[in-house]
């Protein structure tokens, strides 16, 4: 439970904090877990303990192993373990998974990439930043304190970012690098399960025999660009094109609109010269996208000739 993984590259500085916390006044002793041998506190040693911190200046592959820290107070002792792995430097640009720190996400509004573990070190600005091993250049990139700010973030900015800085210990300088993945969240758009605005579920639409009638299927899918979004009509559960009634046609193409910033589509069903048999059919408005499908059913009823009021949303 009180064990922490730490990793670094050979010939770089690595500083590890004891996983057990205590007041600054508490003493912390460090040991090689395997041998129980105490780690010296004298700074002339390459590996030495400095309170809560264990310092490898610089680290060597042979330093890999488990280290024990004991936080001692007048009333209790707390034990923690630091599992340290030091890797050989890669000859190429590739940063293996085991050297990657946690992935961070950014968006247009927030695009800070913090340099992992930097707070443990005695460093001075500016930080150097690399993306997929290429030094970052251009006004869009700003190294600010312990983080990188990217202006006008786009999906292409996703990738692996490495920060490089110098740790200073008693006048000696040691290099440190740390890499993490950055993903871009598209805050401009989102996708929802389709929401049908019209017709209402089980709506009764009044029509006049012999006249033309239009039914509009309208649905919204989210904000921004929508994938695989469509609205369409079915007759008795069959596609309009397969139903084989030339008087009933679905308008070609879909009209895209934006309602309160939402991406919406509508499809008009045109019934020419309404007949009695059309009243027996079930008209289904379907809205679909990647999330799924929603269906609203409409039926037609004969408009009473003496009723001149418009009851488009009249329910029985």
């Amino acid at each position: 439970k009180f064990s922490k993984q730490s990793w670094g590259l050979e010939n770089e500085a690595l500083i590890v904090r004891c996983p057990r916390q205590g007041k600054p006044s508490y003493t912390v002793d460090w040991y090689y877990s395997q041998t129980n041998k105490s780690i010296p506190t004298q700074e002339r040693n390459r590996v030495f303990a400095s309170g809560q911190l264990l310092k490898f200046l610089p680290a060597a592959v042979a330093d890999s192993g488990i280290y024990t820290c004991i936080v001692r107070s007048p009333t209790f002792n707390r034990t923690g373990y630091a599992n340290v792995t030091i890797y050989k430097k890669q000859s190429d640009c590739n940063v293996p998974d085991y050297l990657m720190y946690s992935t961070v996400s950014g968006s247009e509004k927030n695009s800070k990439i913090y340099c992992p573990t930097i707070d443990l070190y005695n460093w001075t600005a500016p930080l150097e930043w690399f993306k997929n091993c290429q030094a970052l250049q251009g006004s869009r990139y700003r190294a600010h304190k312990s983080f990188l700010v990217i202006d006008n973030v786009m999906t292409e900015d996703a990738g692996d970012y490495t920060c490089k800085f110098i740790h200073n210990e008693n006048g000696a300088n040691y290099s440190v690098t740390a890499t993490r993945s950055f993903t871009v969240k598209d805050e401009q758009g989102f996708s929802l399960f389709p929401v049908i605005g019209a017709p209402a579920q089980n709506e009764i639409k009044e029509v006049e025999i012999g006249k033309n009638a239009n039914l509009t299927c309208s649905a919204c899918f989210g904000k921004g660009t929508q994938f695989l979004a469509a609205v369409l009509w079915q007759l008795n559960g069959t596609k309009i094109t397969d139903f084989g009634e030339p008087r009933i046609q679905q308008e070609e193409g879909q009209n895209q609109s934006f309602s309160n910033g939402l991406a919406c589509l509508d499809m008009v069903l045109r019934i020419a010269d309404v007949k009695e048999e059309d009243l027996l059919l079930q008209y289904d408005c379907l809205a679909l996208n990647l999330h799924g499908l929603r269906r609203h059913t409409v039926r037609l009823s004969r408009k009473n000739p003496i009723d001149h009021h418009s009851h488009h949303h009249h329910h029985h």
Partner: antibody
């Protein structure tokens, strides 16, 4: 754990009918699209069509419209791909895939061999 | 129908080398593009979705970029298990379509 388990390999003669299955488990079967993908020997992936099991609504790629039928039985969380009259050119590996924002889970594939 | 064209058809590289695969759409698909890896006798495996998002459990050496009509899958340093066929797929519009595939083989 989300799983799609497909029925076993089939060897058929031209003109015969066939129905292969894809059983979903570990998720709400009715709430996700199921797609079917064909891969002919040594060739690439071809999207055939899709079904929304909660509604049984299907959508086909134009190349497969009228050639196959996609259906589902939500009571047993199973999607189907069927042929009424097989041809030698239907010989292929057929995969089902769940779509949840992308084709995120795939069945192991069903090999269909049509030969006289 | 949106046509996806992948290039090159075959890429011959050695382990440790960088692989760059291209996918071009006949019309804009925004960022509705996915990449899959397929090994012989196995079902395809999702690597990247929405052009640049790594799927769960996919190593950091795989990265996707691009939007609109031009997309790239990059494998920063090829591991022996990465030699396979890679497909791009658009899910912007109906019908969903795949590219014809790029085979990454050992040089």
């Amino acid at each position: 754990e989300v799983q799609l388990v497909q029925s076993g390999a089939e060897v058929k003669k031209p003109g015969e009918s066939l129905k292969i299955s894809c059983k979903g488990s570990g998720y709400s079967f009715t709430s996700y699209w199921i797609g079917w993908v064909r891969q002919m020997p040594g060739k690439g992936l071809e999207w055939m069509g899709i079904i929304y099991p909660g509604d049984s609504y299907t959508r086909y790629s134009p190349s497969f419209q009228g050639q196959v039928t996609i259906s589902a039985d939500k009571s047993i969380s199973t999607a189907y791909l069927q042929w009424s009259s097989l041809k030698a050119s239907d010989t292929a590996m057929y995969y089902c895939a769940r779509i949840g924002g992308m084709f995120d889970y795939w069945g192991q594939g069903t090999l269909v061999t049509v030969s006289s | 129908e949106i046509v996806l064209t992948q290039s090159p058809a075959t890429l011959s590289l050695s382990p440790g080398e960088r692989a760059t695969l291209s996918c071009r759409a006949s019309q804009s698909v925004a960022n509705a593009l996915a990449w899959y890896q397929q090994k012989p006798g196995q079902a395809p495996r999702l690597l990247i979705y929405k052009a640049s998002n790594r799927a769960t459990g996919i190593p950091a050496r795989f990265s996707g970029s691009g939007s609109g009509t031009d997309f790239t899958l990059t494998i920063s340093s090829l591991e022996p298990e990465d030699f396979a066929v890679y497909y791009c797929q658009q899910y912007y519009g109906w019908p969903i379509t795949f590219g014809q595939g790029t085979k990454v083989e050992i040089k």
